[in-house]
């Protein structure tokens, strides 16, 4: 995957197809949620900064047996340059804060939306 350089300030450029698909998958999850997502599983909260894709994957990869987020996990792995395995943690995790997967997904989506509105909305 390329086209990720300068992501923090995209200006008038819309996201790459891969990133667009990630956003759409997060939208699908948040909008189609009926029962508690992943049975209410908890994951480490992360700092939504430059390395957030790897951090998000490191957090979500510890949730197993939840088909609803499997596609998201696969997509995030495409944005993370190194291999991520369960139990792996980076400094981007807020290690004293755990949140529900549903909230984690919502926070990630809101952050991505904010990033793409930067430079467009005053």
């Amino acid at each position: 995957l390329t086209c990720l350089g300068g992501f923090a300030s995209p200006g008038p450029v819309p996201p790459s197809t891969a990133l667009r698909e990630l956003i759409e998958e997060l939208v699908n999850i948040t909008q189609n949620q009926k029962a508690p997502l992943c049975n209410g599983s908890m994951v480490w909260s992360i700092n939504l900064t430059a390395g957030m894709y790897c951090a998000a994957l490191e957090s979500l990869i510890n949730v197993s047996g939840c088909s609803a987020i499997e596609k998201t996990q696969r997509m995030l792995s495409g944005f993370c340059p190194h291999k991520v395995s369960a139990g792996q943690f980076s400094s981007l995790h807020v290690r004293d804060t755990k949140i529900e997967v549903a909230q984690f997904v919502k926070d990630l989506l809101l952050h991505l939306k904010k990033l793409f509105r930067e430079g467009q909305f005053n």
Partner: antibody, heavy 119, light 107 residues
Framework: QVQLVQSGAEVKKPGASVKVSCKAS????????IHWVRQAPGQGLEWMGA????????AYNQKFKGRVTMTTDTSTSTAYMELRSLRSDDTAVYYC????????????WGQGTLVTVSS | EIVLTQSPATLSLSPGERATLSCRAS??????LHWYQQKPGQAPRLLIY???QSISGIPARFSGSGSGTDFTLTISSLEPEDFAVYYC?????????FGGGTKVEIK
């Protein structure tokens, strides 16, 4: 179901202002941007600008900058578009529409509000 | 500003015929191009998004293609209710812009 319901038709004199409202229902209001598009009689569609209800951030078409103000009231899930210093060529149907993010399509539209500017 | 040019301005066809509408962008907009249908006295209705993605509830006879600067909306076999004005829209960057429209009228 998703609905965008706009205020009724207005007749204004040149130089006056108009404020059109757009009440949203059937979805989480702050999750979607509200964009405004107008259509003069027998003409095409023209994008006026947009507002992000979550932050209040706006983006205006340069053509309307200084004359248009877009606002939202999240407590009532209502968006507003005010156009000032009206001219006869502002006579048009004004539509509100929602977009998840600016590059997405306009998937739901209000019914339109006819604003007539005449002396 | 991205300028969208639609052609032809008017298309005169009979029910059952195939309609091919063109939209050309003044610069590369990848697949950030959406199509709308508008009937008299009504708000526009979304038909196709991202150049070729179909919308649930929209008949399969409507299809879109293209990428970059050249895009096409095809109606495989015109039904009486398809006679309307069709607009393309740039979703690539602000200001969002629309094509001038193509009116599909009964021959």
């Amino acid at each position: 179901q998703v609905q965008l319901v706009q205020s009724g038709a207005e007749v204004k004199k040149p130089g006056a202002s108009v404020k059109v409202s757009c009440k949203a229902s059937g979805y989480t209001f702050i999750d979607y941007e509200i964009h405004w598009v107008r259509q003069a009689p027998g003409q095409g569609l023209e994008w006026m600008g947009a507002i992000d209800p979550e932050t209040g951030g706006t983006a205006y078409n340069q053509k309307f900058k200084g004359r248009v103000t877009m606002t939202t009231d999240t407590s009532t899930s209502t968006a507003y578009m005010e156009l000032r210093s009206l001219r006869s060529d502002d006579t048009a149907v004004y539509y509100c529409t929602r977009i998840l993010l600016y590059y997405y399509p306009m998937d739901y539209w209000g019914q339109g509000t006819l604003v007539t500017v005449s002396s | 500003e991205i300028v969208l040019t639609q052609s032809p301005a008017t298309l005169s066809l009979s029910p059952g015929e195939r309609a091919t509408l063109s939209c050309r962008a003044s610069q590369n907009i990848s697949d950030y191009l959406h199509w709308y249908q508008q009937k008299p006295g009504q708000a526009p209705r979304l038909l196709i998004y991202y150049a070729s993605q179909s919308i649930s509830g929209i008949p399969a006879r409507f299809s879109g293609s293209g990428s970059g600067t050249d895009f096409t909306l095809t109606i495989s076999s015109l039904e009486p209710e398809d006679f309307a004005v069709y607009y393309c829209q740039n979703g690539h960057s602000f200001p969002l812009t629309f094509g001038g429209g193509t009116k599909v009228e009964i021959k």
